[in-house]
Amino acid sequence: EPPTACREKQYLINSQCCSLCQPGQKLVSDCTEFTETECLPCGESEFLDTWNRETHCHQHKYCDPNLGLRVQQKGTSETDTICTCEEGWHCTSEACESCVLHRSCSPGFGVKQIATGVSDTICEPCPVGFFSNVSSAFEKCHPWTSCETKDLVVQQAGTNKTDVVCGPQDRLRHHHHHH
């Protein structure tokens, strides 16, 4: 009765178990009773990343600059090329097949997490006591100016988009206060 299974680094062919080809090599010919599996290294710009019986190696991924892509890690005979995005852009998917511009946080929102090559900007609403008056991919919410520390008073309350406006102390009240 011929075998129905093989060990993990083997494959079943013609009722016998042949050795798989190592990563970085492709299958040229199956083994026989008297000859081992014949494998050949993948060519330039090709790879195979597992023990395999593939007759063709896979082409390395092309990082298309027209799509905002650049090479993060050059491929080898055993690994694919890893693409990432140009500065200011991030991948649209895990496979990083194309890029989009990092989004900016609108006024009233600040940057919670700066974008990376693989993740977009994360914005957060400015809480009470903080503001952002610009659209930015880098700026966090800023704290309102503390008028008191400058020996000034609030003339106009701050919002999530604007800072407080400080003004001089009322001289009369200031005078009465000291007498």
Epitope: A5, C6, Q22, C39
Partner: antibody, heavy 127, light 107 residues
Framework: EVQLLESGGGLVRPGGSLRLSCAAS????????MNWVRQAPGKGLEWVSY????????DYADSVKGRFTVSRDNSKNLLYLQMNSLRAEDTAVYYC????????????????????WGQGTMVTVSS | DIQLTQSPSSLTASVGDRVTITCRSS??????LAWYQQKPGKPPKLLIY???SLEGGVPSRFSGSGSGTDFTLTISSLQPEDFATYYC?????????FGQGTKLEIK
């Protein structure tokens, strides 16, 4: 230290059942293929069964097919052999053995061997 | 199933002798053959894998050769600790099979 330790052997009546265990230590058990090999008193070695690292693939000697079941629990580093419908001819020392794939990337196709063996557990089938 | 036949079944030799044990397969198994040494009451110990590669820690007096159907295990100069039973095993396909063993005894 890399070790395999079998347990669960003993005296059992013909037609009875027994479950052998093999506890692995000192290596990443879940990365290795495993085997059971037995040796009847005064006789040679007989391969009994094989299980892949994930437990997905199993194979058996014709003499035990349909009666024995090999399994593994990688979370507990344990290998098992469930033996049913036992016969007198199943009397033997049962060893668990680790399959290893020897490979040198500059070399050819690599080769298998059983590089780590337990001390064995005795199974006696007798009325 | 692939049958392995070892010869001789038993062998008497002296310390310092060169000893050769052969293993013949019923069909071609390329170089998918291993050799083991077993002493009484002990589990087998791997000596050779891939027909000719020496397992780590095994003395260089042990060597293996052959491919296809005919294989040999050679001990170049017998030492007292080499007296044991030797088995060949094919790992080319399932069911994996062992030779019947060769018992090496002291003269």
């Amino acid at each position: 230290e890399v070790q395999l330790l079998e347990s669960g052997g003993g005296l059992v009546r013909p037609g009875g059942s027994l479950r052998l265990s093999c506890a692995a230590s000192g290596f990443t058990f879940g990365s290795y293929e495993m085997n059971w090999v037995r040796q009847a008193p005064g006789k040679g070695l007989e391969w009994v069964s094989y299980i892949s690292s994930s437990g997905e693939t199993t194979d058996y000697a014709d003499s035990v097919k349909g009666r024995f079941t090999v399994s593994r629990d990688n979370s507990k580093n344990l290998l098992y052999l469930q033996m049913n419908s036992l016969r007198a001819e199943d009397t033997a020392v049962y060893y668990c053995a680790r399959d290893v794939f020897f490979f040198d990337s500059s070399g050819d196709n690599g080769a298998y061997g059983m590089d780590v063996w337990g001390q064995g557990t005795m199974v006696t089938v007798s009325s | 199933d692939i049958q392995l036949t070892q010869s001789p079944s038993s062998l008497t030799a002296s310390v310092g002798d060169r000893v050769t044990i052969t293993c013949r397969s019923s069909q071609g198994i390329r170089s998918s053959l291993a050799w083991y040494q077993q002493k009484p009451g002990k589990p087998p110990k791997l000596l050779i894998y891939g027909a000719s590669s020496l397992e780590g820690g095994v003395p260089s007096r042990f060597s293996g050769s052959g491919s296809g159907t005919d294989f040999t295990l050679t001990i170049s100069s017998l030492q007292p600790e080499d007296f044991a039973t030797y088995y060949c095993q094919q790992l080319a396909s399932f069911p994996s099979t062992f030779g019947q063993g060769t018992k090496l005894e002291i003269k």
